[in-house]
């Protein structure tokens, strides 16, 4: 999901963008700040035990348009939001997990055996 209404074709920014990073900090980050020519992101997904985990960081311009589009991934429940409008803009992104589909409950509400289905997040 794009938070700033950009066109889908990735265009080079004239300047570097700084983003908050958490659980996703590259080696060249400092004090949980990374830098990129692309987007800042925040993502929520379930780990193997079904616990929601939030990660945030930088996406390089190359391939980021696809990653930010938040396309469904079979058997994975997750949502990602991307932004570029200011430095550390991803501090203000709060994606939520898409709701469980009814068929996710056929074996009862135990997360680790489910085939989770990803929904677009808007």
């Amino acid at each position: 999901k794009k938070e700033d209404g950009e066109s889908t074709a990735p265009t080079a920014r004239p300047k570097v963008l700084r983003c908050k990073c958490h659980h996703h900090c590259p080696e060249d980050s400092v004090n949980n700040i990374c830098s990129t020519d692309g987007y800042c992101f925040t993502m929520i997904e379930e780990d193997d035990s079904g616990t929601p985990v939030v990660t945030s960081g930088c996406l390089g311009l190359e391939g980021s348009d696809f990653q930010c589009r938040d396309t469904p991934i079979p058997h994975q429940r997750r949502s990602i939001e991307c932004c570029t409008e200011r430095n550390e803009c991803n501090k203000d992104l709060h994606p939520t997990l898409p709701p469980l589909k009814d068929r996710d409950f056929v074996d009862g509400p135990i997360h680790h055996k489910h085939h989770h289905h990803h929904h677009h997040h808007h």
Epitope: P14, V16, D28, I33, G38, G60, R86, N87
Partner: antibody
Amino acid sequence: QVQLQQPGAELVKPGASVKLSCKASGYTFTSYWMQWVKQRPGQGLEWIGEIDPSDNYTLYNQKFKGKATLTVDTSSSTAYMQLSSLTSEDSAVYYCARFGYYVDYWGLGTTLTVSS
Amino acid sequence: DVVMTQTPLSLPVSLGDQASIFCRSSQSLVHSTGNTYLHWYLQKPGQSPKLLIYKVSNRFSGVPDRFSGSGSGTDFTLKISRVEAEDLGVYFCSQSTHVPFTFGSGTKLEIK
């Protein structure tokens, strides 16, 4: 053409503060970061920090935290660096420089002399 | 901080000669985006530095093609194919991959 105008020289007393200016022209001020670099004779170039005029976001070299404060005035496309508690160690040439992913244009520099 | 080690400190050349300046970083300058932010500047006496080469090998606008940059990871080279009088001055390498950004100590290109 891109220009970064800086005063040629400043003379200040030890213990005082000084605010150096850098007026940008020839490009959209908010589209690039502004960096500040210190050069002392025989000491090479030292990166002080940078500011993004579009949101006033700053990054500092740890060495200059508490010494330098970066600000901008977007209405006049001017960047400022305030240096506090000046000592002779602060005597140097200070450059402002336009930064996207690398510095492509430098100001002419301000020679700061700290002397009583 | 990333230490940029430049060699030689001084490079005496004759006009028309080829000159090579080397820069080594204490850690890799390959950024997480895949770009390598290593740049070269020339500073003439009494002037501010001027950009020659950005991102290892890209000549900045107006820079003559006798200047070329190469290298990867931690080792980089600036070559001047035929030195002209206007090329004399101090050459600096600089990295903008890691904060704080750092510079080499400079190489003085002078007439032999």
